[in-house]
C-alpha cells in the first residue's frame, strides 16, 4: 500500500473489534457447536410456529381487530425467524459473514425491523385494550378490522423508517484474522470533518433512539395502559384478582426480558467509545443478548397459544379452536343485545375476567395474559351460559 493510500475509516471500537482474533480453544469450539445447534433449532421452531400462526389466524379464522394485531406480530416474528438461518450459518462458518455486504445490510435490517415493529405493535395492542375500557363507546364505534390494518400499516411504515439508519450504516469489515464482520460502520456515509466526534455522536444517537423508541416508550405505553385499565376498573368497584395482574405483568416481562439485555449492552457499546474498558464486556455479552432478542420471535407464538396445560389435547381437536378461544375479540362476544348492551358488556367482561374464563378448558399462563392484552377473555366464540348472561346484561 502506498504511503498516501487512505484506509477505510473505522471507529476505534470497530477497528479494535477487527483486531480480535479467533481462538482454537477446544471448549470454545464446543460452545460454538452448541450455539449453531441452538440457533438452528430456534430457526426451525420460529419458522414453523409463526408460519402456523399466520396460516391459522390469517386463513382459518374470522377476522377481528385482535386477529389483525396477532397477524402483524406473527408476520414480524416470521421475518425475524426467516433471517435466523443466515445468522446460524454465520456462526457455523466460524463467526464470519460470507454472504456479502448487501445481504449483510438486509439481514441486519430485518432484525431491527422486527425490533421496532414488535415494540410498536405491542404498544398499539395495549392502547387498543385501554381504549376499550376507558373509552368503550368510542371503541365500539371506531374499532374495526380495517382501522386496525391501517394502524398496522402506519406502524410498519414507522418501523421501516426507523430501520433505515441501520441499513445505511451496516457494513462488512474484514478482520485481521481473515474473518468478516457484519456490523455498524457509522463512518460509511458522510463521516464529517472529525471521525471521533462522528463516531461518538452517531453511536450514541443509534443506541439511545432504539432504546427509547423500541423499548422504553413501548414499555411505558404498555405499563400506563395497564395502569389506566386497572384504575378505571377500581373506580367501578371491580376487584381484580392478583393472579390476573401477575399474568399481565408476565407479558410485559417477556418483552422486557428478551429485549432489555440487548438494549443495555447496546447503550454500553455506545458508552464504550469513550470508555475502552467497557469494550471487552460488550464484545462478550452482545452476541448472547442479540440471540436472546432473536429468540423473542420464537417465544411469541408460545405466549399466544402453546402454554395451555391441556395444549396437546386442544391441538388434536383443532388448532383453530385453540386460537379462536385465545384471540376472540371482546366486542364480538356479545349476544343478540343492542350495541349499548355490548358496549357495557365489554366493560363488565374486562372487570371480571376470571368469571368469563371459568370454563374447564380456560387457557392459562401467558395465553390468558395475551388474551387480556389483546382485548380477549380467552372465551371461545361459542360462549357458555354465564358469558351469554353477562353479555346480555346491562349495568
Amino acid at each position: 500500500m502506498s504511503a498516501n493510500a487512505t484506509l477505510k475509516p473505522l471507529c476505534p471500537i470497530l477497528e479494535q473489534m477487527s483486531r480480535l482474533q479467533s481462538h482454537s480453544n477446544t471448549s470454545i469450539r464446543y460452545i460454538d457447536h452448541a450455539a449453531v445447534l441452538l440457533h438452528g433449532l430456534a430457526s426451525l421452531l420460529g419458522l414453523v410456529e409463526n408460519g402456523v400462526i399466520l396460516f391459522v389466524v390469517g386463513c382459518r379464522m374470522r377476522q377481528t381487530v385482535v386477529t389483525t394485531w396477532v397477524l402483524h406480530l406473527a408476520l414480524s416474528d416470521l421475518l425475524a425467524s426467516a433471517s435466523l438461518p443466515f445468522f446460524t450459518y454465520f456462526l457455523a462458518v466460524g463467526h464470519s459473514w460470507e454472504l456479502g455486504t448487501t445481504f449483510c445490510k438486509l439481514h441486519s435490517s430485518i432484525f431491527f425491523l422486527n425490533m421496532f415493529a414488535s415494540g410498536f405493535l405491542l404498544s398499539a395492542i395495549s392502547l387498543d385494550r385501554c381504549l376499550q375500557v376507558v373509552r368503550p363507546v368510542w371503541a365500539q364505534n371506531h374499532r374495526t378490522v380495517a382501522a386496525a390494518h391501517k394502524v398496522c400499516l402506519v406502524l410498519w411504515a414507522l418501523a421501516v423508517l426507523n430501520t433505515v439508519p441501520y441499513f445505511v450504516f451496516r457494513d462488512t469489515i474484514s478482520r485481521l484474522d481473515g474473518r468478516i464482520m457484519c456490523y455498524y460502520n457509522v463512518l460509511l456515509l458522510n463521516p464529517g470533518p472529525d471521525r471521533d466526534a462522528t463516531c461518538n455522536s452517531r453511536q450514541v444517537a443509534l443506541a439511545v433512539s432504539k432504546f427509547l423508541l423500541a423499548f422504553l416508550v413501548p414499555l411505558a405505553i404498555i405499563a400506563s395502559s395497564h395502569a389506566a385499565v386497572s384504575l378505571r376498573l377500581q373506580h367501578r368497584g371491580r376487584r381484580r384478582p392478583g393472579r390476573f395482574v401477575r399474568l399481565v405483568a408476565a407479558v410485559v416481562a417477556a418483552f422486557a426480558l428478551c429485549w432489555g439485555p440487548y438494549h443495555v449492552f447496546s447503550l454500553l457499546e455506545a458508552r464504550a467509545h469513550a470508555n475502552p474498558g467497557l469494550r471487552p464486556l460488550v464484545w462478550r455479552g452482545l452476541p448472547f443478548v442479540t440471540s436472546l432478542a432473536f429468540f423473542n420471535s420464537v417465544a411469541n407464538p408460545v405466549l399466544y397459544v402453546l402454554t395451555c396445560p391441556d395444549m396437546l389435547r386442544k391441538l388434536r381437536r383443532s388448532l383453530r379452536t385453540v386460537l379462536e378461544s385465545v384471540l376472540v375479540d371482546d366486542s364480538e362476544l356479545g349476544g343478540a343485545g343492542s350495541s349499548r348492551r355490548r358496549r357495557t358488556s365489554s366493560t363488565a367482561r374486562s372487570a371480571s375476567p376470571l368469571a368469563l374464563c371459568s370454563r374447564p378448558e380456560e387457557p392459562r399462563g401467558p395465553a390468558r395474559l395475551l388474551g387480556w392484552l389483546l382485548g380477549s377473555c380467552a372465551a371461545s366464540p361459542q360462549t357458555g351460559p354465564l358469558n351469554r348472561a353477562l353479555s346480555s346484561t346491562s349495568s
Epitope: R19, L176, P193
Partner: antibody
Framework: EVQLVESGGGLVQPGGSLRLSCAAS????????MSWVRQAPGKGLEWVAR????????DYPGTVEGRFTISRDNSKNTLYLQMNSLRAEDTAVYYC???????????WGQGTLVTVSS | DIQMTQSPSSLSASVGDRVTITCRAS??????LAWYQQKPGKAPKLVVY???QLADGVPSRFSGSGSGTDYTLTISSLQPEDFATYYC?????????FGQGTKVEIK
C-alpha cells in the same frame, strides 16, 4: 512522499513555555489523527499527546495533562504542541507522528530537541 | 496505567540468527500492540501493528505474534540492517505506553 517536519524546539527555563510545530506534506492531513511522542536523551519513547483528524478530541498522559495542549490547523497542514510550566524532566527530542488508522504511528518526523534548564 | 515490560533489555546476535523479543502487558491489550525499530539518531519506524500485521515495506523475516498480555517480535534471520533498538507500544487504553526497549547488537 509523506513528510513530517518539526520545529520550535530550543532551550527554555523551568516554568517557561514553548510551542512546537509540525508541518505535514505528501498526504491528506485532515484525514489522519496525529500524536506527539518524546524521547529523553538515552531513554525510551513516551507518548505525549494525541488529536483526532478534525481536532475535536484530544488525549494526554497524566505526566503532561494540564500543561501541554495539542492542536492542529488543517488548512495549514500543521500540528502544534503548546508546552507550559516546563520542567527539567520535559527535556527530550519531540517527534510528531501520523496515526495509521486510529492508532499505530506509521510515519514520524525527525524530531526537535527541547531542553529545559536554568 | 498499563505497564509494558520488554525482555531482554539487550541481546547480542550474529547475522542469520533467529531473534525473539517479548513484550508483556500488565493487563489484556487485545492485540492492540505495535512494534517499532529505531536506529541511533533516527526516528522510530513502524514494523508491526495490531500485534501480528506487518507494516508496509517491512521484510517478511519480521513477524509478530501473541495474544492477551504476552506478545513477541521475531526476526527469523537477522540482517545487518536489523541491528537497532526495538520498542513495543500498546494502544488499548490511554495512556499508550511503550516498553523500555530492546537493543539488538552485533555479537
Amino acid at each position: 512522499e509523506v513528510q513530517l517536519v518539526e520545529s520550535g524546539g530550543g532551550l527554555v527555563q523551568p516554568g517557561g513555555s514553548l510551542r512546537l510545530s509540525c508541518a505535514a506534506s505528501g498526504f491528506t492531513f485532515s484525514f489522519y489523527s496525529m500524536s506527539w511522542v518524546r524521547q529523553a536523551p538515552g531513554k525510551g519513547l513516551e507518548w505525549v499527546a494525541r488529536i483526532s483528524n478534525g481536532g475535536s478530541t484530544t488525549d494526554y498522559p497524566g505526566t503532561v495533562e494540564g500543561r501541554f495542549t495539542i492542536s492542529r490547523d488543517n488548512s495549514k497542514n500543521t500540528l502544534y504542541l503548546q508546552m507550559n510550566s516546563l520542567r527539567a524532566e520535559d527535556t527530550a527530542v519531540y517527534y510528531c507522528a501520523r496515526h495509521r488508522t486510529n492508532w499505530d504511528f506509521d510515519y514520524w518526523g525527525q524530531g526537535t530537541l527541547v531542553t529545559v534548564s536554568s | 496505567d498499563i505497564q509494558m515490560t520488554q525482555s531482554p533489555s539487550s541481546l547480542s546476535a550474529s547475522v542469520g540468527d533467529r531473534v525473539t523479543i517479548t513484550c508483556r502487558a500488565s493487563e489484556n491489550i487485545y492485540w492492540n500492540l505495535a512494534w517499532y525499530q529505531q536506529k541511533p539518531g533516527k526516528a522510530p519506524k513502524l514494523v508491526v501493528y495490531a500485534a501480528t500485521q506487518l507494516a508496509d515495506g517491512v521484510p517478511s523475516r519480521f513477524s509478530g505474534s501473541g495474544s492477551g498480555t504476552d506478545y513477541t517480535l521475531t526476526i527469523s534471520s537477522l540482517q545487518p540492517e536489523d541491528f537497532a533498538t526495538y520498542y513495543c507500544q500498546h494502544f488499548w487504553i490511554t495512556p499508550w505506553t511503550f516498553g523500555q526497549g530492546t537493543k539488538v547488537e552485533i555479537k
